[in-house]
């Protein structure tokens, strides 16, 4: 029961986590313009992995996708890749874990197969969570680095002048969503791995019965072996006769030359 609960909870936690990773990846608020020095600005900018948005104080918002792949920083591309890998691994993990759930019966799937699938999905969730956490952390590091490297330069163009404004960007909501989602996916994966141990079929431990011949005139009663097979009326391995047939639990520790195992 505990195994099923652990597996089920792991699945649900991972599902929430992966939904969060997808949400974070699609969100536009990865970096938001820092308004510390200019709190009354009419327009501010926030940017995601895929597009840039501007928002007015009135609430009017406009977003545009980045034009090119080549003009974007390598770090941004790396973050995109990490998040996509996280989503793909998580989605495959979810698919595998659905079939691995103990509460779902699919044909005559053995427990060993379910255990293997649970472990596989668990590992996938762990890697997925790590990818998301890594992606968000790389992006956060990029923001922090850029924040403290504020420089502005000017150059003259055709007829006029273009000034590069070093706008400081700070952590957006997507970063926190990504960190939490990655953590949940990771926790879900660990729970699935723990559940896998409980699902693995253990060796059946039948109680061995040893017979102690106390003398040469021992009369073995018919049906004595019913104790070991577990099919007779005597399924609890109780002593059937006084001749010395005992369950392994009852065997005395001192050796005897008449012991037969």
């Amino acid at each position: 029961m505990a195994v099923t609960a652990c597996q089920g909870l792991g699945f649900v936690v991972s599902l929430i986590g992966i939904a969060g990773i997808i949400a974070a990846t699609c969100m536009d608020q990865w970096s938001t313009q820092d308004l510390y020095n200019n709190p009354v600005t009419a327009v501010f900018n926030y940017q995601g992995l895929w597009r840039s948005c501007v928002r007015e104080s009135s609430g009017f918002t406009e977003c545009r996708g980045y034009f090119t792949l080549l003009g974007l920083p390598a770090m941004l591309q790396a973050v995109r890749a990490l998040m996509i890998v996280g989503i793909v691994l998580g989605a495959i993990g979810l698919l595998v874990s659905i079939f691995a759930l103990k509460c779902i019966r699919i044909g005559s799937m053995e427990d060993s197969a379910k255990a293997n699938m649970t472990l596989t999905s668990g590992i996938m969730f762990i890697v997925s969570g790590l990818c998301a956490i890594a992606g968000v952390s790389v992006f956060a590091n990029m923001l922090v680095t850029n924040f403290w490297m504020s420089t502005a330069n000017m150059y003259t163009g055709m007829g006029g002048m273009v000034q590069t404004v070093q706008t400081r960007y700070t952590f957006g909501a997507a970063l926190f969503v990504g960190w939490v989602a990655g953590g949940l996916t990771l926790i879900g994966g660990v729970m699935m791995c723990i559940a896998c141990r409980g699902l693995a079929p253990e060796e059946t431990n039948y109680k061995a019965v040893s017979y102690h011949a106390s003398g040469h005139s021992v009369a073995y009663k018919p049906g004595g072996f019913k104790a070991s097979t577990g099919f007779g009326s005597n399924t609890k391995n109780k002593k059937i006769y006084d001749g010395g047939a005992r369950t392994e639990d009852e065997v005395q520790s001192y050796p005897s030359k008449h012991d037969y195992v």
Partner: nanobody, 120 residues
Framework: EVQLVGSGGGLVQPGGSLRLSCAAS????????TGWYRQAPGKQRDLVAT???????NYADSVKGRFTISRDKSKNTAYLQMDNLKPEDTAVYFC??????????????WDAGTQVTVSS
């Protein structure tokens, strides 16, 4: 690169009208605000009017009710309609655009300036 081309300046009599235009070109992702500053001889550059991407406008007190700023979003062009011009409006009018050109790449572009002279 981002380029701004301003036009429409010239000589006009007091009480007359002029229309300045400012066209932005290049790899512009988001055009945040566009507007004009003016600089009279021997004076500092002052804000005339601005318009945001959403159409919110802002005017200097000295031009309120006489000047109107507008924009054509599809052409990335802003217009400054100047009515009831006064001699004190004589200056070089500089068009500017605050733009996002890429990932965490914000720039302010200026044109070379357009001379507006109000004289009888």
């Amino acid at each position: 690169e981002v380029q701004l081309v301003g036009s429409g300046g010239g000589l006009v009599q007091p009480g007359g009208s002029l229309r300045l235009s400012c066209a932005a070109s290049g790899s512009i992702l988001n055009l945040m605000t566009t507007g004009w500053y003016r600089q009279a001889p021997g004076k500092q550059r002052d804000l005339v009017a601005t318009i945001t991407f959403g159409g919110t406008t802002n005017y200097a007190d000295s031009v309120k009710g006489r000047f109107t700023i507008s924009r054509d979003k599809s052409k990335n062009t802003a217009y400054l309609q100047m009515d009831n011009l006064k001699p004190e409006d004589t200056a070089v009018y500089f068009c500017y655009a605050d733009v996002i050109v890429g990932f965490q790449d914000r720039r302010v572009a200026w044109d070379a300036g357009t001379q507006v002279t109000v004289s009888s």
